[in-house]
């Protein structure tokens, strides 16, 4: 039902990589424009977006509020230009999101590889810990922070002179491997959240391999 | 439920090949990682080797690097181990394992094997 | 590639005894290594992960600890369904490798 020129928005679904959360809808707008609303389970609704011509609404700063809690969104569609018109009941037409639970759903960003360095026989990698738009204490907080022992980093590493790929992981954002001498390697990491059934892996880093500029090398 | 089912086992002749297939259910394969796990008659469990299909990248163990490859197809929810240039000691039983990609990297789900007997 | 020496290759055990199982890693593994259950024509299950984690549905007579490079496998109490064969596993570098497993029979 509804006004006879308002369509109900459709196709709710959320777009989150390390807590940057962007809920899109369908359709294009022909003649109409949408409010976004969003609650916790037990909260109170509060509005986003008011009568936006756009199909989408970035709710990061509500989500981040609490990011283990489970949100729902809702999007109210309205005839442009007469935004008080409402459905037949009385109501201006929505429609409900999927529920989205942050901690465990968010897709994890592609890693950095921040650093090498090697050292004899041994070679030490770091990667960049991701700034989230998460706080605590008006600090914005690292994905380690957010996640804690929750997150762990596997490292692939090969020598530049073959294809096999070895693996490593680490619960910190550091890695210490045993290297041959004199052959050069090459490195990608990718973020795990092993306790989740979905969205588990982050796309793989960039490669990064030693001679180039990143890495250092210390002969001792 | 989450599953695997290993299949394609049998007999082959000195120098054959053969296809296992290890097909999962219950979860998407490029989520895990998949490692194949072989056991001889009356034998200790030999790791094969693995692949992470999310990117393809593998990694095998000495006895049977360059005669096997993994591989896997995520439109099938499908790894494969292809074995050739066959050995009378490459007969036992072969199992894929799911691999959590924890900090210990255990093997939490195994399929229930497939024989395969090499033997003129 | 690091070795997992497990002792003894075989035991034998009455129901109700406590029984030990060890591995030794070569070189230090950390925490990541986990062991296996296996029964004539079956699959290995798992046990314990990261040394000594009960993974679930494990009855809780077994445990798993860990010395430095030495880990230890633990059934406190022997059941009729636990004569089996278990086997350690490291992880901690790539190739993963097993012990030789230990036959668990019966006495």
């Known amino acids: 039902s509804g006004t006879t020129n308002t369509v109900a928005a459709y196709n709710l679904t959320w777009k989150s990589t390390n807590f940057k959360t962007i809920l899109e809808w369908e359709p294009k707008p022909v003649n109409q424009v949408y409010t976004v609303q969003i609650s916790t389970k037990s909260g109170d609704w509060k509005s986003k977006c008011f009568y936006t011509t756009d199909t989408e609404c970035d709710l990061t700063d509500e989500i981040v509020k609490d990011v283990k809690q489970t949100y729902l969104a809702r999007v109210f569609s309205y005839p442009a230009g007469n935004v008080e018109s409402t459905g037949s009941a009385g109501e201006p037409l929505y429609e409900n999101s999927p529920e989205f639970t942050p901690y465990l759903e968010t897709n994890l960003g592609q890693p950095t590889i921040q650093s090498f360095e090697q050292v004899g026989t041994k070679v030490n990698v770091t990667v960049e810990d991701e700034r989230t738009l998460v706080r605590r204490n008006n600090t914005f907080l690292s994905l380690r922070d957010v996640f804690g022992k929750d997150l762990i980093y596997t490292l692939y590493y090969w020598k530049s002179s073959s294809s096999g790929k070895k693996t490593a992981k680490t619960n910190t954002n550091e890695f210490l491997i045993d290297v041959d001498k004199g052959e050069n390697y090459c490195f990608s990491v990718q973020a795990v959240i092993p306790s989740r059934t979905v969205n588990r892996k982050s796309t793989d880093s960039p490669v990064e391999c030693m001679g180039q500029e990143k890495g250092e090398f210390r002969e001792i | 439920e989450v599953q695997l089912v290993e299949s394609g086992g049998g007999l082959v002749q000195p120098g054959g090949s053969l296809r296992l297939s290890c097909a999962a259910s219950g979860f998407t394969i490029p989520d895990y990682i998949i490692h194949w796990v072989r056991q001889a008659p009356g034998k200790g469990l030999e790791w094969v080797g693995y692949?992470?299909?999310?990117?393809?990248?593998?990694y095998y163990a000495d006895s049977v690097k360059g005669r096997f490859t993994i591989s896997a197809d995520t439109s099938k929810n499908t790894a494969y181990l292809q074995m050739n240039s066959l050995r009378a000691e490459d007969t036992a039983v072969y199992y894929c394992?799911?691999?959590?990609?924890?900090?210990?990297?255990?093997?939490?789900?195994w399929g229930q094997g497939t024989l395969v007997t090499v033997s003129s | 590639d690091i070795q997992m020496t497990q002792s003894p290759s075989s035991l034998s055990a009455s129901v109700g005894d406590r029984v030990t199982i060890t591995c030794r890693a070569s070189q230090d593994v950390n925490t990541a290594v986990a062991w296996y259950q296996q029964k004539p024509g079956k699959a290995p299950k798992l046990l314990i992960y990261s040394a000594s984690f009960l993974y679930s549905g494990v009855p809780s007579r077994f445990s798993g600890s860990r010395s430095g490079t030495d880990f230890t496998l633990t059934i406190s109490s022997l059941q009729p369904e636990d004569f089996a064969t278990y086997y350690c596993q490291q992880h901690y570098t790539t190739p993963p490798t097993f012990g030789q497993g230990t036959k668990v029979e019966i006495k």
């Open positions: 692949i992470d299909p999310s990117n393809g990248y593998t």
């Open positions: 394992a799911r691999d959590i990609q924890s900090v210990s990297g255990e093997f939490d789900y």
